[in-house]
């Protein structure tokens, strides 16, 4: 014998209470397959989390995060913190990242500026908190007549480029 | 595939307690420390507590020091969170996560793995 509650379609529900007719699902539910006998309670996005998809009678809402915040674990569950650029996000907050290291992005963690030395060539540009060093040509390619790039002085503040 | 879930939140009145518990499954519990970290309704993730993969090292954020201990039941692959004297603003939803080393500090975010949440309500 066929179970009559197969035939109700996605957004209703088979309530038993009315001889398992076809009941729409009531405001702020929703079900997404057919056959269900329950309809699930719409996700609230609050706080600082906010509505990226409306609740449907069919499917859940979708949050994503407050500007200032990214999204974290399945179906954004969390909102984490972005920091600036410059900076990484620690168990204690946004702090600047360290001389000799960067961070080019509003996630994710700071790192060691490149060792131009390791690859032969000279700094052309000094490291920042935002941006690695850029490397020049090594300095065998600046021999007299070569090239008309020079090595740049050295900065007078670790880390940044002379003003 | 590595999963973990929480359990032991519910509503509390201000002064009171609870004790929290995650189960870990799908890799070596014992090799990796341990977070704890909330979201309160308003706020991004606030880290809380963490615990070094052999249990001798444990951090905690000013805002629960001395009111928090966490632990851990590697013959379990349990991590716990007993939180004391609670108060309202401890109100959140707690996430337990999963570290990327052995050993942990409390400055380097390094969670990999998170649980699904168990919501502490604090209110009279």
């Known amino acids: 014998l066929q179970d009559p509650c197969s035939n109700c379609p996605a957004g209703t529900f088979c309530d038993n209470n009315r001889n398992q007719i076809c009941s729409p699902c009531p405001p702020n539910s929703f079900s997404s397959a057919g056959g269900q006998r329950t309809c699930d309670i719409c996700r609230q996005c609050k706080g600082v989390f906010r509505t990226r998809k409306e609740c449907s009678s069919t499917s859940n809402a979708e949050c994503d995060c407050t500007p200032g915040f990214h999204c974290l674990g399945a179906g954004c569950s969390m909102c984490e913190q972005d920091c600036k650029q410059g900076q990484e996000l620690t168990k204690k907050g946004c702090k600047d990242c360290c001389f000799g290291t960067f961070n080019d992005q509003k996630r994710g963690i700071c790192r060691p500026w490149t060792n131009c030395s390791l690859d032969g060539k000279s700094v052309l540009v000094n490291g920042t908190k935002e941006r690695d060093v850029v490397c020049g040509p090594s300095p065998a390619d600046l021999s007299p007549g070569a090239s008309s790039v020079t090595p740049p002085a050295p900065a007078r503040e670790p880390g940044h480029s002379p003003q | 595939e590595v999963q973990l879930l929480e359990s032991g939140g519910g509503l509390v009145q201000p002064g009171g307690s609870l004790r929290l518990s995650c189960a870990a499954s799908g890799f070596t519990f014992s090799s990796y420390a341990m977070s704890w970290v909330r979201q309160a309704p308003e706020k991004g993730l606030e880290w809380v507590s963490a615990i070094s993969g052999g249990g001798g090292s444990t951090y905690y954020a000013d805002s629960v020091k001395g009111r928090f201990t966490i632990s851990r039941d590697n013959s379990k692959n349990t991590l716990y969170l007993q939180m004391d004297s609670l108060k309202a603003e401890d109100t959140a939803v707690y996430y337990c996560?999963?570290?990327?080393?052995?050993?942990?500090?409390?400055?380097?975010?390094?969670?990999?793995?998170w649980g699904q949440g168990t919501t502490v309500t604090v209110s009279s």
């Open positions: 996560a999963k570290e990327g080393t052995t050993e942990t500090d409390d400055y380097h975010y390094n969670m990999d793995v």
